[in-house]
């Protein structure tokens, strides 16, 4: 017999025929439905949170996640002590600033508490996927008359391990100027016309230095430097998301 | 549906290479995570080498520094370089596959594979 589970993904290749476990491929044994993905990510080296589609499974199920870092193979797991819920179903796991080792193979092992036979054990390089919180306190000064710089902070990560991302555009422009700054988190722009009005923002990411993570933070608040007059098209120069 | 064909295995001496590929078709394996498994006679199956579609690689402890793998999307083949055998390394190895959403996931839990080869032998004679 075929049975197809439906997994809510854009990869339909993952609209899965049974999974069939057993203990070596040729030997089959009764077909087990696969768990889905764990996803995680540490939000500012502060908590970090694993979630799963709880939704993809085809009765509620309240799902365990226990997790361990990779000391050994046969290091002991723990169980998740926060869990997330999505319509009273588990959903996911908040793992406090303390059980964090971002530079230890984290371990986690999802299950079905009903069908112990059900688990899946994932292995994540936690240093890839953190996503720093938003830059903060953006401040213009002129260093000359044609000269700006910008400078910002970020909160609880150390500087070199970030990577920024610096938007700019002039209430004449339709489209950001944007280039890398890397570590330092300051900006001149040598040139500005004062009869123009600018928009500034920054994002980050941990990347290259301390990890490899492709996630940018969030957009800064916008900050804005030059001549207040009334732009011709408001509209046009929206600042977009 | 994925095919997977291993090949490469043989009857190596203690201290030598071998190197094994794992050929796909029928699907890309570009968005796969997929794994390197060994099965010893009368012992569980266990993973070797596992491998998310976003490139993080992990290893079992016992073939940390002396196995290798790599993939080449183009060519729809995963590999396994395996230096300083010993004669512990003798098992079936078999090539595993499993679509995945996220470029980070890496199983090494074998029934979260959908797919996997036959199997080659490798014998490590001492």
């Known amino acids: 017999w075929s049975s197809k589970v439906l997994m809510s993904s854009a990869n339909e290749d993952i609209k899965a025929d049974l999974i069939l476990t057993s203990t070596a491929p040729e030997h089959l044994s009764a077909p087990t439905l696969p768990l889905p993905e764990v996803q995680c990510f540490v939000f500012n080296i502060e908590y970090m949170n694993c979630t799963w589609n709880s939704s993809s499974e085809p009765q509620a199920t309240n799902l365990t996640l226990h997790y361990r870092y990779k000391v050994s193979d046969n290091n002991t797991f723990q169980e998740c002590s926060h869990y997330l819920f999505s319509k009273e179903i588990t959903s996911g796991c908040q793992i406090q600033k303390e059980d964090i080792q971002l530079y230890q193979t984290f371990v986690v092992q999802l299950q079905d508490p009903q069908k112990p036979q059900r688990r899946a054990v994932q292995k994540l390089n936690l240093q890839n996927l953190v996503i720093p919180r938003a830059p903060e306190n953006l401040t213009l000064s002129n260093l000359s008359e044609s000269q700006l710089e910008l400078r910002w902070k970020s909160r609880h990560i150390k500087e070199r391990c970030l990577q920024y991302l610096v938007q700019y555009r002039s209430n004449r422009d339709r489209s950001w100027t944007e280039l890398i700054v890397n570590h330092e988190p300051r900006f001149s722009l040598p040139s500005v016309d004062e009869l123009k009005r600018y928009t500034f923002r920054v994002r980050s990411r941990y990347n290259p230095i301390c990890g490899s993570s492709q996630q940018w933070s969030k957009w800064s608040q916008p900050v804005h430097w030059g001549s207040h007059t009334v732009e011709e098209n408001p509209s046009l120069f929206a600042l977009e998301a | 549906q994925v095919q997977l064909v291993e090949s490469g295995g043989g009857l190596v001496q203690a201290g030598g290479s071998l190197r094994l590929s794992c050929a796909a078709s029928?699907?890309?394996?570009?968005?796969?995570?997929m794994g390197w498994f060994r099965q010893a006679p009368g012992k569980e199956r266990e993973y070797v080498a596992i491998?998310?579609?976003?490139?993080?690689?992990f290893y079992a402890d016992s073939v940390e520094g002396r196995f290798t793998f790599s993939r080449d999307n183009a060519k729809n083949e995963v590999y396994l370089q395996m230096n300083s055998l010993q004669p512990e390394d003798t098992a079936v190895y078999y090539c595993?596959?499993?679509?995945?959403?996220?470029?980070?996931?890496?199983?090494?839990?074998?029934?979260?594979?959908?797919?996997w080869g036959q199997g080659t032998q490798v014998t490590v004679s001492s």
């Open positions: 491998d998310s579609w976003g490139g993080d690689t």
């Open positions: 595993a596959g499993a679509p995945t959403s996220f470029a980070t996931t890496a199983y090494s839990s074998s029934n979260s594979y959908r797919y």
């Open positions: 029928g699907r890309t394996l570009s968005r796969y995570a």
